[in-house]
């Protein structure tokens, strides 16, 4: 199963950690995909490492763990984020996070 904070908020110009936690007694994670709505943010492969989409490469840093640190947030970053865990055996598990970017006070 995937465990995540459903709703998170952060300040404009700040940073936020996008994190999904996968728990299973039998399945191993082989790949994790991160998307902002339908746009690819990053892919983690156990065998190949991290690929961060070039459009986000100056603002997205892998980690901690299989999560992402999203920096220099703008109001346009508000929206849904999806993690997809590919596991073997066990199949695919998805998690959803809604990020609200608030104006800095």
């Amino acid at each position: 199963t995937i465990d995540t904070k459903r709703n998170i908020s952060a300040e404009e110009g700040g940073s936020v950690i996008l994190q999904c936690h996968f728990s299973s007694d039998t399945a191993e994670v082989t790949q994790v995909d991160w998307k902002q709505q339908d746009q690819l943010l990053a892919i983690y492969s156990v065998d190949l490492g991290w690929h961060v989409a070039s459009v986000f490469s100056d603002r997205v840093v892998p980690g901690p763990s299989l999560g992402l640190t999203f920096q220099s947030l703008t109001m346009n970053d508000t929206g849904e984020y999806f993690c997809t865990y590919h596991t073997y055996p066990g199949g695919i598990y998805k998690g959803r996070i809604f990020l609200k970017v608030q104006e800095s006070s």
Partner: antibody
Framework: EVQLVESGGGLVQPGRSLRLSCAAS????????MHWVRQAPGKGLEWVSG????????GYADSVKGRFTISRDNAKNSLYLQMNSLRAEDTALYYC????????????WGQGTMVTVSS | DIQLTQSPSSVSASVGDRVTITCRAS??????LAWYQQKPGKAPKLLIY???SLQSGVPSRFSGSGSGTDFTLTISSLQPEDFATYYC?????????FGGGTKVEIK
């Protein structure tokens, strides 16, 4: 004995294509990611491409992206590199390599196959 | 892409010397760094993976350390068979990248 044997290299004109093969033996090929690494004459090592055990994830060096395609056939214990639109700067010795499980260090290498791109 | 800068590019040393080669990454790569030895006309040989894990069969005079952006390969007592070129390689980010190499020559 764990072994990787590359083939398919040769002399080719710029703009043409070539397909390299790597035959694996002595280990369960389908359990491992596999990689291609090249070395131009007198130069250093350059990672070219990698592919996961099930072809689910693939990576390429920027210098070959859009021109080279890595693939594998686990039933045939074989790794391939389809090279299109070849350039003089692709001239190199091409190695296939296998990683240490879960480490991403490449512990088994073939002897290499030479690709020369020249008119 | 991650740039790996090795230094020195070459080093002259004698048998028995302690040799240290450094590899600096342009961004943090955790401990996803490997070291290879290559001799002329031969395929590279894996020495160290995971920054500090010694590959099976590699002599204990080779050691690796570091994490993040700064890494070191140390040969504690150089042997005649150690004269070769050494490369670091990162595997945290795609595309994987190699350092430019360090040639260890006989003084």
């Amino acid at each position: 004995e764990v072994q990787l044997v590359e083939s398919g290299g040769g002399l080719v004109q710029p703009g043409r294509s070539l397909r390299l093969s790597c035959a694996a033996s002595g280990f369960t090929f389908g359990d491992y990611a596999m990689h291609w690494v090249r070395q131009a004459p007198g130069k250093g090592l350059e990672w070219v491409s990698g592919i996961t055990w099930n072809s689910g994830s693939i990576g390429y060096a920027d210098s070959v992206k859009g021109r080279f395609t890595i693939s594998r056939d686990n039933a045939k214990n074989s790794l391939y590199l389809q090279m299109n639109s070849l350039r003089a700067e692709d001239t190199a010795l091409y190695y296939c390599a296998k990683p240490v499980p879960k480490s991403r260090g490449l512990d088994v290498w073939g002897q290499g196959t030479m690709v020369t791109v020249s008119s | 892409d991650i740039q790996l800068t090795q230094s020195p590019s070459s080093v002259s040393a004698s048998v028995g010397d302690r040799v240290t080669i450094t590899c600096r990454a342009s961004q943090g790569i955790s401990s996803w760094l490997a070291w290879y030895q290559q001799k002329p006309g031969k395929a590279p040989k894996l020495l160290i993976y995971g920054a500090s894990s010694l590959q099976s069969g590699v002599p204990s005079r080779f050691s690796g350390s570091g994490s993040g952006t700064d890494f070191t390969l140390t040969i504690s007592s150089l042997q005649p068979e150690d004269f070769a070129t050494y490369y670091c390689q990162q595997a945290f980010y795609l595309p994987w990248t190699f350092g430019g190499g360090t040639k260890v020559e006989i003084k």
